[in-house]
């Protein structure tokens, strides 16, 4: 209370003291900061706390995204784009909210995280909680059997997220898929691929991808004795095998999940294996897998994907896991998933995985779950785990503090004397209607050193100052910020000069 | 808690330059007016100079105005104080400062300051 | 500039004495005014902001009074731990000036 009493009576000297100051018709840029001092006081004092108790903040699982990060990101996001357009996709969109029926249904124990919206005048709504399912909906609602497109949107998911960790409820997802009858695993070598180049491309660290096949896992059940009905919950034990170890999975599958201590025991012998090839190989000499027929498909095409890996180049980044086996209900073939990797502490150890940054699978039924007649059209496709990259990305720039420039203005336009407003307007539209970025300050008469300080804050390369004697000459003082070496330069030239400069192509194509 | 950490000074000729640093911890750097102030060993304190929020204001004490710049990094949490032209008057323990209620100019926290020496 | 004048510039008093500081500004400051203690190789630290308002964790025994030109920290019984320099600053125009201090002795 006493805090809040200061508060007020602070407003209220500083209330006086702008007064006083307009009366005595003090200097405007004193006014000026006096009274934002005022204002900032006033907000400090927020509502009166009798009357509001609220905290602004953003909701639980969500954040802001200051100029800092929106450069991260857009850097993110080109390599991703970059990567998706060279490999051919094209772009979509769809709502951020589906039908509630529509999402019903295809993501097993992980519909609890679905958010529903309330009642909008009688439709049921969800917010999207991936971008597959929308994809899905839309090509069985277009009739489409073909095509290769990539999403980039935010989805949301109920979850206690550990923020810290680049996990929220709203997150971006960077999804590729490709949809169509092809010859088999020609399109998911290709997404492997995509997913390779595009964690390659971002820098961040060792990465391994892990891959898996549905049927290799449901027969692999099947033949350890694991009933129909339990193979989803029992899936999504084993996917916990890269967080937990064995026992503790044992211990859920058995005690929580009702499993046989002996088919838990048969299990484990198939599901702490990982390897390559080798391990295909070795899988499609095993007796009693290699006698059930999804397994066998399974394993036929891992081993046509490692042949395509190893043309693509990327063998060597893909490890062959059999705990592998990714929460999503609606995957029926091969499924993938990219960790980064930490240093081991001594040589010799395995590498360890800090967290998924990328995933995917083929989900071939998913489409005809939306047809009348069940028409499926087969699919496969990745997802980037943008969010992660971000955190990854961010932290490295801060370790290595390292300056990121948050606009891309090329040049300022500035002048070195007084009453030259007019003429700098002329010339920033001018360098505008050239497409070049420009800025200028917004103050009729600024000090030129002021102007200059802007630059290095805001890591503008280039000064365009405009002086009376220039202007007489038909010249421009085109000075390099960093350099701050100055040379006149025509007027006539100065956009070709500038272009030239910050190697901008000197035609808008 | 609030921490503001000087760094930077030392022993310079008349006519040198230095650069002060101020680390902050603690509390929101980007919404405080910060300062500097100094005081000569065995004199009083005189406030130097402080610069807003936001970096749009800046004043300067008669006695350093065109030698020091004060400047701030809202992203690294930290204050400077760039000295050229050094005198030696200009000897004191200099301390990083932090305003009252963001804006007031008291100086509510206070480093443990930074000596800085100009003598031949 | 506002020039700030202390008294006395120095005063010897025993522990548990009610001691009075006075400033006075060269011209009106209203209440933005603020006193200071500094002890020896120490920062100095905030006793009172804006003539009366005490400063959190400050013990009640200091308070500050005035408005305009002159203003008065009292210290109403000493403690062993206030014997320090003290010094009030004005807060309404830049440059901002202290007054030359009042160092507070054992006697």
């Known amino acids: 209370m006493a805090e809040r009493a200061a508060l007020e009576e602070l407003v209220k000297l500083q209330g006086e003291r702008v007064r006083g100051l307009k009366q005595q018709k003090a200097s405007a840029e004193l006014i000026e900061e006096e009274v934002a001092k005022l204002l900032k006081l006033k907000a400090q004092l927020g509502p009166d706390e009798s009357k509001q108790k609220f905290v602004l903040k953003t909701p639980k699982g969500t954040r802001d995204y200051s100029p800092r990060q929106m450069a991260v990101r857009e850097k993110v996001f080109d390599v991703i784009i970059r990567c998706f357009k060279r490999h051919g996709a094209e772009v979509i969109d769809t709502p951020v909210f589906e039908l509630k029926e529509t999402l019903m249904g295809k993501y097993g124990e992980d519909s609890k995280l679905i958010y529903d919206l309330k009642d909008q005048g009688g439709e049921l709504l969800s917010l999207r909680y991936d971008l597959t399912v929308p994809f899905a909906r839309y090509l069985a609602m277009n009739k489409l059997t073909n095509i290769k497109r990539y999403h980039i949107a935010k989805v949301y998911r109920r979850d206690n997220p550990a923020m810290t960790r680049g996990r929220y409820r709203e997150f971006y997802q960077c999804d590729f898929d490709i949809a169509g009858n092809f010859d088999p695993m020609i399109p998911d070598a290709e997404c492997l691929k995509i997913m390779c180049e595009i964690l390659s491309s971002l820098q961040i660290g060792d990465f391994l991808v892990k891959v898996n096949d549905r049927r290799i896992l449901d027969g692999m059940f099947a033949i350890c004795g694991v009933s129909d009905s339990k193979f989803r919950t029992i899936c999504s034990s084993v996917d916990k095998l890269d967080k937990v170890s064995w026992e503790e999975v044992k211990n859920e599958m058995v005690g929580e999940k009702g499993l046989a201590p002996e088919v838990a025991d048969r299990i484990g012998d198939y599901v702490q294996q990982h390897g390559g090839v080798s391990l295909v190989e070795q899988l499609l000499q095993d007796p009693k897998l290699s006698q059930n027929k999804q397994a066998l498909e399974g394993l036929g095409d891992l081993k046509l994907l490692f042949e395509y890996l190893t043309l693509f180049g990327i063998d060597d980044k893909i490890s062959f896991d059999l705990s592998l086996a990714r929460g999503l209900d609606y995957y029926t073939g091969v499924i993938y998933e990219a960790v980064l990797l930490q240093t081991p502490a001594q040589a010799g150890e395995e590498p360890l995985g800090v967290g998924s940054v990328a995933a995917g699978g083929r989900y071939d039924g998913l489409v005809g779950m939306f047809d009348p007649k069940g028409r499926k059209v087969p699919c496969v496709g990745l997802s980037i785990g943008v969010e992660r990259i971000f955190s990854i990305v961010e932290q490295r720039l801060e370790a290595l503090e390292e300056k990121i420039r948050t606009t891309e203005t090329q040049v300022l336009v500035a002048s070195a004397q007084k009453k030259l407003l007019e003429e700098r307007l002329k010339l920033v539209s001018e360098l505008w209607d050239a497409g070049i970025k420009a800025e200028l300050l917004y103050k009729k008469n600024p000090k030129l050193l002021n102007q200059l300080q802007y630059c290095e804050e805001a890591g503008i390369p280039l000064v365009a100052i405009i002086g009376e004697q220039e202007l007489k000459d038909g010249v421009i003082k085109l000075r390099s910020v960093t350099s701050r070496e100055e040379v006149d330069v025509r007027r006539e030239d100065l956009v070709e000069e500038i272009k030239r400069r910050t190697g901008q192509p000197l035609c808008i194509c | 808690q609030v921490q503001l950490v000087e760094s930077g000074g030392g022993l310079v000729k008349p006519g040198g330059s230095l650069r002060l640093s101020c680390a902050a911890s603690?509390?929101?750097?980007?919404?405080?007016?910060m300062s500097w102030i100094r005081q000569a060993p065995g004199k009083g304190l005189e406030w130097v100079s402080y610069i807003s929020d936001s970096s749009r204001y800046t004043k300067y004490t008669d006695s350093v105005r065109g030698r020091f710049t004060i400047s701030r990094d809202n992203a690294k949490n930290s204050l400077y104080l760039q000295m050229n032209s050094l005198r030696a008057e200009d000897t004191a323990v200099y301390y990083c400062?932090?305003?009252?209620?963001?804006?007031?100019?008291?100086?509510?926290?206070w480093g443990q300051g930074t000596l800085v020496t100009v003598s031949s | 500039d506002i020039q700030m004048t202390q008294s006395p510039s120095s005063v010897s008093a025993s522990v548990g004495d009610r001691v009075t500081i006075t400033c006075r500004a060269s011209?009106?400051?209203?209440?933005?005014l603020a006193w200071f203690q500094q002890k020896p190789g120490k920062a100095p630290k905030l006793l009172i902001y804006?003539?009366?308002n005490l400063e959190s964790g400050v013990p009640s025994r200091f308070s500050g009074s005035g408005s305009g030109t002159d203003f008065t920290l009292t210290i109403s019984s000493l403690q062993p731990e206030d014997f320090a320099t003290y010094y009030c600053?004005?807060?309404?125009?830049?440059?901002?000036?202290f007054g030359q201090g009042t160092k507070l002795e054992i006697k």
């Open positions: 400062a932090r305003y009252l209620y963001q804006v007031i100019a008291i100086a509510k926290s």
């Open positions: 804006v003539a009366s």
């Open positions: 600053q004005q807060a309404n125009s830049f440059p901002y000036t």
């Open positions: 603690g509390f929101t750097f980007s919404d405080y007016y």
């Open positions: 011209q009106g400051i209203s209440s933005w």
